[in-house]
Interface confidence: low
């Protein structure tokens, strides 16, 4: 059915960058200014996204593809397709409703975005603290006395940081 319909439908011949213009006997017309169609056979063109204010244009709109935005310096993207821009903070801080706040003691943030995370608890793995944590850096766990046999690695790297809201695999 789908194949039969497309053979009969003159709009199916309209390529990306055009629309099937019912006002002109279903002739393929170029998309009007500031609009695009990314697939063929469309009866309308979509309005181009405008990257205004805190958004800036990463990729210009063309007749066949929408504009893509990113954020001006001092901000970073959030959401699918950079639907929001969120203020950056310094390393060692997190963004709260009242602005950027330093990480509480016992937590750190080594990025300009995201939340402060607790330092790794070395003792849970039977390790000891080799390098103390700071607001910007996690602790570095050292070996337990039992690990100091010849050939053993002397430092265990910290667990990889996880993005907030992601559960471990």
């Amino acid at each position: 059915f789908e194949r039969t319909r497309s053979l009969q439908d003159p709009c199916s011949n309209c390529p990306a960058g055009t629309f099937c213009d019912n006002n002109r006997n279903q002739i393929c017309s170029p998309c009007p200014p500031n609009s695009f169609s990314s697939a063929g056979g469309q009866r309308t063109c979509d309005i181009c996204r405008q990257c205004k204010g805190v958004f800036r244009t990463r990729k210009e709109c063309s007749s066949t593809s929408n504009a893509e935005c990113d954020c001006t310096p001092g901000f970073h993207c959030l959401g699918a397709g950079c639907s929001m821009c969120e203020q950056d903070c310094k390393q060692g801080q997190e963004l709260t409703k009242k602005g950027c706040k330093d990480c509480c003691f016992g937590t750190f943030n080594d990025q300009k975005r995201g939340i402060c995370r607790p330092w790794t608890n070395c003792s849970l793995d039977g390790k000891s603290v080799l390098v103390n944590g700071t607001k910007e850096r996690d602790v570095v766990c050292g070996p337990s006395p039992a690990d100091l046999s010849p050939g053993a690695s002397s430092v265990t790297p910290p667990a990889p940081a996880r993005e907030p809201g992601h559960s471990p695999q």
């Epitope: 309209c14 390529p15 960058g17 055009t18 002109r24 170029p30 066949t64 593809s65």
Partner: antibody, heavy 119, light 110 residues
């Protein structure tokens, strides 16, 4: 940089056809429209039509319907404008111009091609 | 489709401001914010000066500005300079997916 290079001047007899070319460079050819605009000696600008460089679809000014054909060759980034059944009043400079995408304007223009129709 | 109406000529002295009008209908100038203005020196191709009613492309002097009210668009040139002497054309997108130019205005700098 962005360039639209047009073919050279032509002299034609009434009733003949002329085909003017416009080679684009310096931008992604298939992402933009190209327009054709003409200007008779001492007269104003006259919009003739638009071609979508990727799909090849066209829209022509009503005045030129049936006499003008716009085509493109994506392999050479070239658009063509053919005008048939020439008459003396078609004597003009013919310009190709890029459609400034996201806007109803023409941001880059070719240098123009003079077509003279004379018996 | 009919052309947009512009005054045939305007003039001004260096340093003065001048305004060129461009009158259409609700199917073109009044219906869309897609009015543009072009400057053309003798023997040269037109150059885009204003697009989308009031936006200046990079490289165009901020002495050039555009506006629109109803079916009439306007181009204002302030601090007139000798090199501004040229022909000026407006253009608009139309409801029939076509474009239309104005009749053209000759600007003379006295």
């Amino acid at each position: 940089q962005m360039q639209l290079v047009q073919s050279g001047a032509e002299v034609k007899k009434p009733g003949a056809s002329v085909k003017v070319s416009c080679k684009a460079s310096g931008y992604t050819f298939t992402s933009y429209y190209l327009h054709w605009v003409r200007q008779a000696p001492g007269q104003g600008l006259e919009w003739m039509g638009i071609i979508h460089s990727s799909g090849g679809s066209t829209t022509y000014a009503q005045k030129f319907q049936g006499r003008v054909t716009m085509t493109r060759d994506t392999s050479t980034s070239t658009v063509y404008m053919e005008l048939s059944s020439l008459r003396s009043e078609d004597t003009a400079v013919y310009y190709c111009a890029r459609g400034y995408f996201g806007s109803g304007s023409f941001d880059y223009w070719g240098h123009g091609t003079l077509v003279t129709v004379s018996s | 489709q009919s052309v947009l109406t512009q005054p045939a000529s305007v003039s001004g002295s260096p340093g003065q401001s001048i305004t060129i009008s461009c009158t259409g209908t609700s199917s073109d100038v009044g219906g869309y914010n897609y009015v543009s203005w072009y400057q053309q020196h003798p023997g040269k191709a037109p150059k885009l000066m204003i697009y989308d009613v009031s936006n200046r492309p990079s490289g165009v002097s901020n002495r050039f500005s555009g506006s629109k009210s109803g079916n009439t668009a306007s181009l204002t040139i302030s601090g007139l300079q000798a090199e501004d002497e040229a022909d000026y054309y407006c253009s608009s997108y139309t409801s029939s997916s076509t474009y239309v130019f104005g009749t053209g205005t000759k600007l003379t700098v006295l």
